[in-house]
Interface confidence: low
């Protein structure tokens, strides 16, 4: 599968497994699914801590991961065509296993809207910082990876398996080894809670002697919401150790008989359960009558009880269950208020960040600030947003309108801007003329020059800056364009229908490009723009005059 289970944490009614292996999100989900789970949800701070713990287990010691940042898939995805919803904590993403739009989120940074492809979420771990329960892994969204191409995939993933309930780990009263096999095919000898339908293999004895005994148990549902192994009495008991080994495997008290045998007992106020090991309280709160995080408080003399809710919750009409108090009704925030279980949090709209005077205040994010501008050229900050602009000769481009693209003025929508030859450059253009013609002072038109078979005028050569048009005599056939000041190929002309009769012969000549009259004093490096041209003196159909050129990389007809 490309992934190995290397860590497992079971808590509450779920187990989380962490895996390393460069899989796509789809492959990771398939791996979890094969064992009856899904990519993990992170629906609360508590769940985030469970996931953090299993990742910490996976990444301990000299992990193979050498990168400073590491990512692990979780089950949060957004389908192609579904757009970002900034008003929701999950921003329009949803959990792969289904379920409601949960209030907890921990995004790494502001999400950019893009609906054109499926997006998947991973947990971002900064390996240069220690994990703390207060510093939970951030959520990072991005492409979902490609099956079969490890280079495009991230370091691992986390699965979640949910169960009806859990059994307590088996307690041994003497030497032995317990091996649990879970329904999701993980074996472990150390689980805090063991999921329903797991098997436990108990090998009693010292391990290096022949006198080992084996027991096999299943974690079963004994009664609604009551799960146990169906074992009776401590396991692997040994007269040699009595109560000295692991308290005889007893939950509370261990009482030894004279012959090395022993029994488990319970402290005052507790009773021994059917497994003859575990103790449960006798008081009315022991049946956990309070729900939804409510605490059971014993009344006088232990006869009755009341339920008490934690801060941010209140009892419902049954007086047994806690319901969340909606603190947002008091409008405590400047912009967005998100009611959370037991509290609330203030959020800022896209384009704003927490800050400014007062609790829950927001201030504008200066997206154009030095070092963080998303724009290729000009950036203007606005309240809650920004917009990009481009220098003259460029237009906004890119999916998000932050890039600038050169305008090819020579093939612009208004038709050619020059009467004869047009040289596109980065951010600008120049006009030129055919042999025998010179550029008029307006820099666009061509006028008849002194009779000459010189080359067309165009951008200057390194050596020829300032030379008069038409002052050289052409020599050879289709030569490469000369190179400009920075050593990049210079522009070759695009011809437009000249406003002159095209019966002047065109000789085979290198295009020695000269400065057009009226060209700006500052040289702007042009990009290559080839003319589609014949290589000899001829008259193309339609009466167009063409200039023969060939690029030095052997391509033609493309910019």
């Amino acid at each position: 599968t490309g992934a190995d289970t290397e860590a497992v944490v079971c808590v509450g009614t779920a187990c989380y497994t962490a895996h390393s292996g460069k899989l796509s999100a789809a492959e990771a989900q398939n791996h979890c699914n094969q064992n009856g789970g899904n990519l993990a949800t992170v629906k609360s701070k508590e769940e985030a801590q469970h996931v953090q713990r299993v990742l910490a287990q996976l990444l301990r010691r000299e992990a193979a991961l050498t990168a400073r940042m590491s990512k692990f898939w979780i089950g949060l995805q957004r389908e192609k065509g579904k757009c970002l919803d900034p008003s929701l904590p999950l921003k329009g993403f949803s959990w792969v296993g289904g379920g409601e739009d949960t209030p907890y989120s921990n995004w790494h940074k502001e999400l950019r809207n893009s609906c054109i492809s499926k997006r998947c979420v991973s947990l971002l771990l900064d390996l240069s910082q220690p994990l703390l329960p207060s510093r939970l892994p951030k959520w990072s969204e991005g492409p979902c990876g490609s099956p079969g191409s490890p280079g495009s995939n991230i370091e691992g993933f986390v699965c979640k398996f949910s169960f009806k309930g859990m059994c307590r780990p088996l307690a041994l009263g003497g030497p032995g080894q317990v091996t649990y096999t879970t329904p999701f095919q993980t074996t472990s000898s150390s689980l805090e809670a063991v999921p329903f339908a797991s098997a436990a293999n108990v090998a009693c004895g010292e391990g290096d002697k022949d006198e080992t005994q084996s027991h096999y148990f299943l974690c079963k549902e004994k009664a609604p919401d009551v799960f146990d192994w169906g074992s009776s009495g401590p396991l692997c008991v040994s007269p040699k150790y009595g109560c000295n080994f692991n308290n005889g495997g007893c939950h509370q008290d261990c009482f030894e008989g004279g012959d090395g045998s022993f029994l488990c007992g319970c402290r005052p106020g507790f009773r021994l359960l059917d497994d003859l090991v575990t103790c449960a309280s006798r008081n009315p709160c022991s049946s956990s009558p309070c729900r939804g995080g409510a605490t059971c408080v014993l009344g006088p003399h232990g006869k009755n009880y009341t339920c008490r809710c934690p801060q941010g919750y209140q009892l419902d009409s049954s007086q047994l269950d806690c319901v969340d108090v909606d603190e947002c009704q008091d409008s405590p925030c400047a912009q967005e208020c998100v009611n959370t279980p037991g509290g609330f949090r203030c959020e800022c709209w896209v384009g704003y960040e927490p800050g400014g005077p007062g609790e829950g205040a927001c201030q504008d994010v200066d997206e154009c600030a030095l070092g963080r501008s998303p724009c290729a050229q000009g950036c203007t900050n606005t309240d809650g947003s920004f917009h990009c602009s481009c220098e003259e000769g460029y237009v906004l481009a890119g999916e998000d309108g932050t890039q600038c693209q050169d305008v090819d003025e020579c093939v612009g929508p208004g038709g050619p801007l020059c009467d004869s030859l047009c040289f596109n450059t980065q951010g600008s253009f120049h006009c030129g003329c055919l042999p025998g013609w010179v550029l008029a002072p307006n820099g666009v038109s061509c006028t008849m020059g002194p009779v000459s078979l010189g080359p067309p005028s165009g951008p200057p050569d390194e050596e020829d800056k300032g030379e008069k048009e038409g002052s050289t005599v052409p020599r050879a056939a289709t030569a490469s364009p000369t190179r400009g000041p920075e050593g990049t190929p210079k522009a070759t002309p695009t011809t437009s229908r000249p406003s002159l009769s095209s019966d002047a012969p065109i000789t085979s000549a290198p295009l020695k490009m000269l400065a057009p009259s009226g060209s700006p004093g500052v040289w702007r490096e042009p990009s290559i723009h080839h003319a589609t041209a014949a290589s000899g003196p001829q008259e193309p159909a339609g009466g167009d005059s063409s200039v023969a050129t060939q690029n030095n990389d052997g391509t033609d007809g493309q910019k």
């Epitope: 287990q57 220690p130 703390l132």
Partner: antibody, heavy 122, light 107 residues
């Protein structure tokens, strides 16, 4: 081979200062949180302070908070403990130790130095 | 702070004996527990991490178990080089805390 070597211990008067150093080798120093643990003569182990791999996060026991400062120089692979306003009860062998995990704090301490004795006495 | 209580504080045993040391946390610490061995004049040495995982290079006669609040270090067959003081340490939360130690002496 992972090695941690402490230095800088010695005799100091109450109220005085001392700076301990711990030179690390054999592993990528900047990837690991590091801790100082002390042991008073004939007593058990007491965690004193810790610092994250990057040096961005520091942690202290209440007994030394405000008096001791932990720092590190990742370019020199060295951990430091600046001890000010020393008291008689700070007398102990001070060990520098590596946190066993690159990712979780606090963690077990998988490699220890040989220790350096600090005696605070008038 | 989480208190760690070890028992017994000292014990006498013979080579070949099975020795069990227990450590109890004042609150649940999941499996975030380590065991160390310290010999006189030497630095502590990590034996067990994550309650039951054997540190690389440590003999297999050492084993750890437990979860939550109750933990056990077992030496299945005591060897001469195992006479030392053993400490448990929780690393569930800051500050990490150690047990007071259990001294294993020759009977």
């Amino acid at each position: 081979e992972v090695q941690l070597v402490e230095s800088g211990g010695g005799l100091v008067q109450p109220g005085g200062s001392l700076r301990l150093s711990c030179a690390a080798s054999g592993f990528t120093f900047s990837s690991y949180a590091m801790s100082w643990v002390r042991q008073a003569p004939g007593k058990g182990l007491e965690w004193v302070s810790a610092i994250s791999g990057s040096g961005g996060s520091t942690y202290y026991a209440d007994s030394v908070k405000g008096r001791f400062t932990i720092s590190r120089d990742n370019s020199k692979n060295t951990l430091y403990l600046q001890m000010n306003s020393l008291r008689a009860e700070d007398t102990a062998v001070y060990y520098c130790a590596r946190d066993g995990s690159r990712i979780y704090f606090p963690d077990d301490l998988d490699y220890w130095g040989q220790g350096t004795l600090v005696t605070v006495s008038s | 702070d989480i208190q760690m209580t070890q028992s017994p504080s000292s014990l006498s045993a013979s080579v070949g004996d099975r020795v069990t040391i227990t450590c109890r946390a004042s609150q649940g610490i999941s499996s975030y527990l380590a065991w160390y061995q310290q010999k006189p004049g030497k630095a502590p040495k990590l034996l067990i991490y994550a309650a039951s995982s054997l540190q690389s290079g440590v003999p297999s006669r050492f084993s750890g178990s437990g979860s939550g609040t109750d933990f056990t270090l077992t030496i299945s067959s005591l060897q001469p080089e195992d006479f030392a003081t053993y400490y448990c340490q929780q690393h569930y939360t800051t500050p990490p805390t150690f047990g007071q130690g259990t001294k294993v002496e020759i009977k």
